[in-house]
């Protein structure tokens, strides 16, 4: 919290930044519709004045819809509900009769559009366990829109993996919903050799879908289990 600092009138001093470390990161991306706050806390004697430039030119209220707000006592400028046209370089110029300093922030305004689900690479991971053991598959989902998660396994019917239509037989083991806790995790307990095979994490939202799979190897009891390397 940096406010104006009163200094002895005899100690004349050119403007200076009160905390240069905080001003090292210059490029900032902000989601559209949010608010941006620029600050350039400074000291000096006499107390410096502050003005703002956008892309090297005087920044005027009429340069953006809704204008902007300034609080000189906090060395700050606020722009509400930013839009892509607010992108640019914002420079605070702090000056008194003994000198002038400036600092530029590079603002990028990003418009977020919903996308199909993204699944973290490498998940679910292949796993192995002994007969009677437990195993857990994890699927990490990133989705703007509400995702629907399904855990699916290829199964056989009457000794066949494929139906008359040529499509594989699939069994939904778990799916997201009110009665399903933590749909991103599929836990298998007391596994048998029949549980071996491919497990698919399928995630969909209203835009699209994505899926990734992992293999479970079930070992005889005398072999030690271990997580396979990718």
């Amino acid at each position: 919290a940096e406010d104006f600092v009163s200094e002895n009138s005899n100690n004349k001093r050119a403007p200076y930044w009160t905390n240069t470390e905080k001003m090292e990161k210059r490029l900032h991306a902000v989601p559209a519709a949010n608010t941006v706050k620029f600050r350039c806390p400074a000291g000096g004697n006499p107390m410096p004045t502050m003005r703002w430039l956008k892309n090297g030119k005087e920044f005027k209220q009429e340069h953006r819809i809704g204008g902007y707000k300034v609080r000189n006592q906090h060395w700050s400028l606020i722009m509400e509900s930013v839009v892509p046209s607010d992108k640019g370089n914002y420079t605070c110029v702090v000056e008194n009769e003994y000198g002038s300093i400036n600092h530029t922030y590079h603002l990028d305004v990003v418009e977020r559009s919903p996308h199909r689900p993204i699944l973290q690479a490498g998940l679910p991971a292949n796993a192995s366990t002994v007969v009677g053991g437990d195993v857990e598959f994890v699927c990490k989902v990133y989705s703007d829109a509400q995702p629907h998660i399904q855990w699916i396994k290829h199964v056989e019917k009457n000794g066949s993996k494929y139906g008359p239509d040529g499509l594989p037989y699939l069994k939904v083991l778990k799916h997201s919903g009110i009665n399903s806790s933590n749909a991103e995790v599929l836990a298998l307990f007391n596994v048998t050799e029949a549980d071996a095979g491919e497990y698919i994490c399928k995630v969909s939202n209203y835009i699209g879908q994505a899926n990734q799979s992992a293999w479970l190897t079930v070992l005889p009891k005398q072999q030690a289990p271990g997580r396979e390397k990718e």
Epitope: P31, N34, T35, V36, K37, R39, P41, H74, S76, S113
Partner: antibody, heavy 127, light 107 residues
């Protein structure tokens, strides 16, 4: 005009579950966030949690962590508060509020401000 | 958690009075402080954000000041519609926390 309408409140037994909905209109849903705030009868405001509608990230108060889940369906412009393992002390009016970020580029953190609120829905946990 | 303490808890005032409510944070919250107004049976309304910025549509008789740990909400000339409960709220720390509220009543 920005509007938020909560629904789903009611009477539930301790240990039970309830899902509250917050239907939003009048703004670009994925640009900002939704917070849930509750107010026990005759008491002050308590922040419950928040979701950022763009990336789906969530934050929760310690008092509800592990029991409550905030989610959103952007196709329906609706946010949800799934409340499990409910306790008597969860009895309150629950508000949803549009939440935008003030991105302070100097200190590199985001201040969250709740600018539009729903009318609230009452949740009573009692046997 | 950051504790927010408001004072006074309640006050009685008349229309036209100048009213000041203070809010103290248990640790530095910089300028990350908002003020809300709530009438009985209604949802809160945002008045001030970032300690001193007036939210759009809020009358100019409301003002906020302060930084760090000490903050003030001032109503320069109290109007009949201003009788309500006022809450401060910080969001620099997790979790966001509210003050206990200050009830402004008619004298």
């Amino acid at each position: 005009e920005v509007q938020l309408v909560e629904s789903g409140g009611g009477l539930v037994q301790p240990g039970g579950s309830l899902r509250l909905s917050c239907a939003a209109s009048g703004f670009t849903f994925t640009s900002t966030g939704i917070s849930w705030v509750r107010q026990a009868p005759g008491k002050g405001l308590e922040w419950v949690g928040r979701t950022h509608l763009g990336d789906g990230s969530t934050n929760y108060a310690d008092s509800v962590k592990g029991r409550f889940t905030i989610s959103a369906d952007t196709s329906k412009n609706t946010a949800y508060l799934q409340m499990n393992s409910l306790r008597a002390e969860d009895t309150a009016v629950y508000y949803c509020a549009r939440t935008y970020g003030i991105y302070d580029l100097y200190v590199d953190y985001t201040e969250y401000v709740m600018d539009y609120w729903g009318q609230g829905t009452l949740v009573t946990v009692s046997s | 958690d950051i504790q927010m303490t408001q004072s006074p808890s309640s006050l009685s005032a008349s229309v036209g009075d100048r009213v000041t409510i203070t809010c103290r944070a248990s640790q530095d919250v910089d300028t990350s402080l908002a003020w809300y107004k709530q009438k009985p049976g209604k949802a809160p309304k945002l008045l001030i954000y970032s300690a001193s910025f007036l939210y759009s549509g809020v009358p100019s008789r409301f003002s906020g000041s302060g930084s760090g740990t000490d903050f003030t909400l001032t109503i320069s000339s109290l109007q009949p519609e201003d009788f309500a409960t006022y809450y401060c709220q910080q969001s620099t720390g997790h979790p966001q926390t509210f003050g206990q509220g200050t009830k402004v009543e008619i004298k």
